[in-house]
Interface confidence: medium
């Protein structure tokens, strides 16, 4: 009985911890310069030139709003938004019917409270060159 009670207590503690972490993901503690605000919720970084580079991030805290400089590294996967970074599996085999191959990406890193898909699928055409490479590289790591 005591053992069951201990397990229940542990479970409750874990639940409290995960909900606290989830809440914290939405709000980044960053008191703006000279601000008395403790909890700032920051939007995604909007780069000045289309996809990446230096830009602005807008934040809110109660009735306050603020804009600060930010930088989106230019090597992030642009097609899925500069605020989401994915870890990709190896390319799958070439589908003879469609002439394409597929690989799946799992969300590795999200910037602040960015809206990111947990998994994404990428397709690309398989050229004769990549077909031959795929045979030679079978079982090897990244493309």
């Amino acid at each position: 009985m005591q053992h069951r009670g201990f397990l229940l207590l542990t479970l409750l503690a874990l639940l409290a911890l995960t909900s606290a972490v989830a809440k914290k993901k939405d709000k980044v503690k960053k008191g703006g310069p000279g601000s008395e605000c403790a909890e700032w919720a920051w939007g995604p970084c909007t780069p000045s030139s289309k996809d990446c580079g230096v830009g602005f991030r807008e934040g809110t805290c109660g009735a306050q709003t603020q804009r600060i400089r930010c930088r989106v590294p230019c090597n992030w996967k642009k097609e899925f938004g500069a605020d989401c970074k994915y870890k990709f599996e190896n390319w799958g085999a070439c589908d003879g019917g469609t002439g394409t191959k597929v690989r799946q990406g799992t969300l590795k890193k999200a910037r602040y409270n960015a809206q990111c898909q947990e998994t994404i699928r990428v397709t690309k055409p398989c050229t004769p060159k990549t077909k031959a490479k795929a045979k030679a590289k079978k079982g090897k790591g990244k493309d």
Partner: antibody, heavy 119, light 107 residues
Amino acid sequence: EVQLQQSGPELVKPGASVKIPCKASGYTFTDYNMGWVKQSHGKSLEWIGDINPNNGGTIYNQKFKGKATLTVDKSSSTAYMELRSLTSEDTAVYYCARWSYSNPYFDYWGQGTTLTVSS
Amino acid sequence: SIVMTQTPNFLLVSAGDRVTITCKASQSVSNDVSWYQQKPGQSPKLLIYYASNLYTGVPDRFTGSGYGTDFTFTISTVQAEDLAVYFCQQDYSSPWTFGGGTKLEIK
């Protein structure tokens, strides 16, 4: 040619409100945010806030929250700043000036509207 | 707010002189600093952006430099038409803030 046209001088009584227009021409109005800047007599410049004409999104200098309200009318390419509960402290020249995320500096300014608050 | 401390407040120079104005930010603002010129009775005009880039149509006697917290604005050879107040401004973090201004007068 880019132009930001502001209205003429305003003389208003303490406690009243005033709405200052800034009509933009010579560029795509929605491509740039419109900022507002205050210059008290013989003093420096103070950024009041700015507005994104696309979605009406505003960011204010905390100092001017509750004092200034920024709006836009896309159909006439005009930005407005309303100042309320006016006091002698609000006597100043008010400028509108455009900026964008890709050009984050005030590259064009209106000629300024002189506001005098006096009974 | 980031405070931009501009020095000197006033400069009295002769035509042909070299003039230097400095601006110190209360925290790092990277190179996100602009310089403006305001002639009597006129609205401010952009001269320099990103600390050192000369804005279109601005004579090259105007230059800017600096990074982080310390910035310098220079007029290599002052001309009579340069009579104005000069302001620095940071657009690194809102609220955007301006220096107190430097009034330049010609002897």
